[in-house]
Structure formats: C-alpha cells, structure tokens
Interface confidence: low
C-alpha cells in the first residue's frame, strides 16, 4: 500500500501544473530543480512561496544561465520593468526612456526622447555657445536702464528623426545698459 | 506718493468705442515708460499696451488681441496717458489698469476702471 | 507650450514658509521675471523682479519675500505666512516689445 501511495503522489505531482518542466517537484514547494534550458523562478503569493521552471522569465526578472542551474534574476537595474541581463534593461517602467540599458526620466545631452517608443535616440548636436553680444535694445545701445543681450550656437549634427526638435540655438537674457541715455 | 486714477469707463456695445483716461501724479511722468493691463473677470492679467516716453519717439506697443483696435497715447504736459479703443468685442470686457512701466515691468498700479462690452 | 507655467493653487498654514514656482519655456529660461501679487478685487502690486541668482524688490515689499532662480525655474519663497499674504501671485515676463503673465497661483492659508 505504501508503494502504491508513493507511486500515485508521484504521478499526481507530474501531472500538477507547477511541477510542468521540473526534474524534481514537491507539492509545498513546487519545483527546486528545473530540466535542462528551462529556468527556475521563485514564484511567491502572499506568504507562500513555490518554484516554477519556465521557458522565459517574467517582467522584472533576467535569465540568468549557469551549469548547476538556470535561474530567473531579478532586474537590479533602477525604474527597470524588464531587463535582458543584470545591467542591461530592455524595457523601463512606465514615465521612465530606455538608453543605453537604462532608464531615465529625462534623456541625457545629446539625447531626444521618442515618445512612441519611450526610448532616447540621438539627438540635435549643437556647439559651444558663443559670447554674449552687445546690450540693447530695438537696435539702440542706450537709452534704457536694462536690454537684451543674446547668443548663439550652432548646429553641428542633425538629430536621428526629423521629428526631434534641435535645442535652442539662440538665446538672450536681459542686461543692464552701460549707458541710460544716448549721446546727443 | 505714486497715484494713478483711471476713468473712462462703461458699458459699450460690439464693435463701438471708449476712451480711457489714466491721470498721474507723485513722480515725474515724462520720465516713465506707461502701460495699460487688463482683467477680464476671474481672469488673469494681460498686457495690453505700451508707450515710451519722448526720448523714445513716444514710441508703443501693443498686445496681438488688440493691434489695429486700440491706440495708447500720452500727453505729458497734463500728466495723462490714454487708451483709445475702436471696434470693441465682448472678449474686451474687463477691468483696465493703468501702470507705470519702470522698464518693462509695472511698479505702480491704478484701482482700475470697468469696461463692459455688450449687446 | 505656455510661456510662464504656474501652479493653479497653494496652501499653507499660518507661520509657515511657501514656495511659489514660474517655470519659463526653454527659449525664455533665461529670462527674468517679475512677481505680482493680487488680493481680492484689488489693483496688483509689484513685488520684485527675479534675476539669475539675485531680485529686486518693490516699495512695500516685507522682508519675508525674496526670490531665487534655477534653470528655467523661478520662484517667489515666502517666510512666516501670513493671513495678508492670502492673494493670487502672477509671475510676469517682458520679452522685448510684449509682456507676458502666468496664468497666476491662488495662495490659501489653512
């Protein structure tokens, strides 16, 4: 009878869902060990926690290959939603652009957001910024306590798409006049 | 002490006219750049015009809503800067300011006087 | 996008301290700014005008106001609230031959 309890547990066991792809299975804790190219993922719901032997891993989680065995990692990688090794993301969370296997919430220089594809692709290269020009205002170097001054760079690589706007190549600021009133 | 006493006010109808009056004292008026503001109710603020002062030509500026309908205009020797206003629209309907302009900026603000465009 | 942004509404208590932001588009960032405040049914008062690192203020203006700027913020600090300090606060923006104001941010004292 004891043979017969054992051989049915086991039939039971291989036949449960969570012990789909395992080499060894037990009804607590699902798999601990997984057939070979498959890759073991600790599965936990609520205060439970059970083995589970996958094809691919999860959102969050990378395949991680050994020779003991495969393993499901869990992305490390900040704002990450899924990842393809411990530093290279795939996919961000949602808010957050893909670069480089990262994710940002503002693309780095010389990198425009794409927001179809939440990613940063090469942006508006532009120049070092020139001096600040002459102080005036409506053409006249005096005549007012304050003016504008402006400066300029210059576009030295257009972006990856036409859609991804350049940064501004000319700006101007406000400046305090050398001279209130004009001669004459 | 810095007083500007707007007046002119009321209630027009579309496409009519109005003349507001700005009088000003407590500072030497020729010396000021004016600007007329402008508070369509429970609305924010808007810029609606601006004058130099005779170093400048009297030179103005207007606000894109109003160019080619109002017309800001000054007249130092009383103290006083206008605004002339033609082809008056319900969207006109507001409280006007009158401010001095230190330099593109208003230091100084009247009470304001009511414009009421409507048919 | 807006040329100024401000945030429609603030509160704060009595005592504390506030900080009211205007954020520029990018092709006014440097810019500076001035900072109106307006009680209800009122004229508006200038308070000061906020300059890279620096501002300077209006006739009136009390010691507890002060201005500062980073990047394409400015902003309008406001120390040991008060109940007069209840009002709305518009930021504003000269850009050449026209002026500019924030939609304006509706201060409440809790």
């Known amino acids: 009878q004891g043979n017969r309890w054992r051989r049915n547990k086991r039939a039971s066991y291989v036949s449960n869902p969570i012990c789909k792809g395992c080499l060894s299975c037990s009804k607590d804790n699902g798999c601990s060990r997984c057939q070979q190219k498959l890759f073991f993922f600790l599965r936990r719901e609520g205060m439970r926690q059970y083995g589970e032997c996958l094809h691919s891993c999860p959102s969050g989680y990378y395949g991680h290959r050994a020779p003991d065995m495969n393993r499901c990692a869990r992305c490390r990688i900040e704002n990450c939603d899924s990842c393809f090794s411990k530093d290279f993301c795939t996919k961000c969370k949602v808010g957050f652009y893909l670069h480089r296997g990262r994710c940002f919430d503002e693309c780095p220089d010389g990198f425009a957001p794409l927001d179809e594809t939440m990613e940063c692709v090469e942006g508006c290269e532009v120049g070092h910024w020139s001096e600040w020009g002459t102080c005036s205002r409506n053409n006249r170097t005096c005549g007012f306590k304050w003016g504008l001054e402006t400066r300029t760079r210059q576009i030295v690589k257009k972006p990856a798409k036409d859609t991804i706007p350049c940064p501004t190549i000319a700006e101007s600021r406000r400046c305090k006049m050398a001279m209130r009133h004009c001669p004459g | 002490e810095v007083q500007l006493v707007e007046s002119g006010g009321g209630l027009v109808k579309p496409e009519g006219s109005l003349k507001l009056s700005c009088v000003a004292s407590g500072f030497t008026f020729s010396d000021y750049f004016m600007s007329w503001v402008r508070q369509a109710p429970g609305q924010g603020l808007e810029w609606v015009a601006h004058?130099?002062?005779?170093?400048?030509?009297?030179?103005?500026y207007y606000s894109g809503s109003v160019k080619g309908r109002f017309s800001i205009s000054r007249d130092d020797s009383r103290n006083m800067v206008y605004l002339q206003m033609n082809n008056l629209r319900t969207e006109d309907t507001a409280t006007y300011y009158c401010?001095?302009?230190?330099?593109?900026?208003?230091?100084?603000w009247g009470q304001g006087t009511q414009v009421t465009v409507s048919s | 996008q807006p040329v100024l942004t401000q945030s429609p509404s603030v509160s704060a208590s009595l005592g504390a301290s506030v900080k009211l932001t205007c954020t520029l588009s990018s092709q006014h960032s440097t810019n500076y700014i001035e900072w109106y405040q307006q009680h209800p049914d009122k004229s508006p008062k200038f308070l000061m005008q906020?300059?890279?690192?620096?501002?300077s203020k209006g006739d009136g203006t009390p010691d507890r106001f002060s201005g500062s700027s980073s990047g394409a913020h400015r902003y309008l600090s406001i120390s040991n609230l008060q109940l007069e300090d209840e009002a709305i606060y518009y930021c504003g923006l000269s850009d050449v031959s026209l002026y500019l104001f924030g939609s304006g941010t509706q201060l409440t004292l809790l």
């Open positions: 401010t001095t302009d230190e330099d593109w900026y208003f230091d100084f």
């Open positions: 004058i130099y002062t005779k170093t400048y030509n009297y030179a103005t």
């Open positions: 906020v300059r890279d690192g620096s501002h």
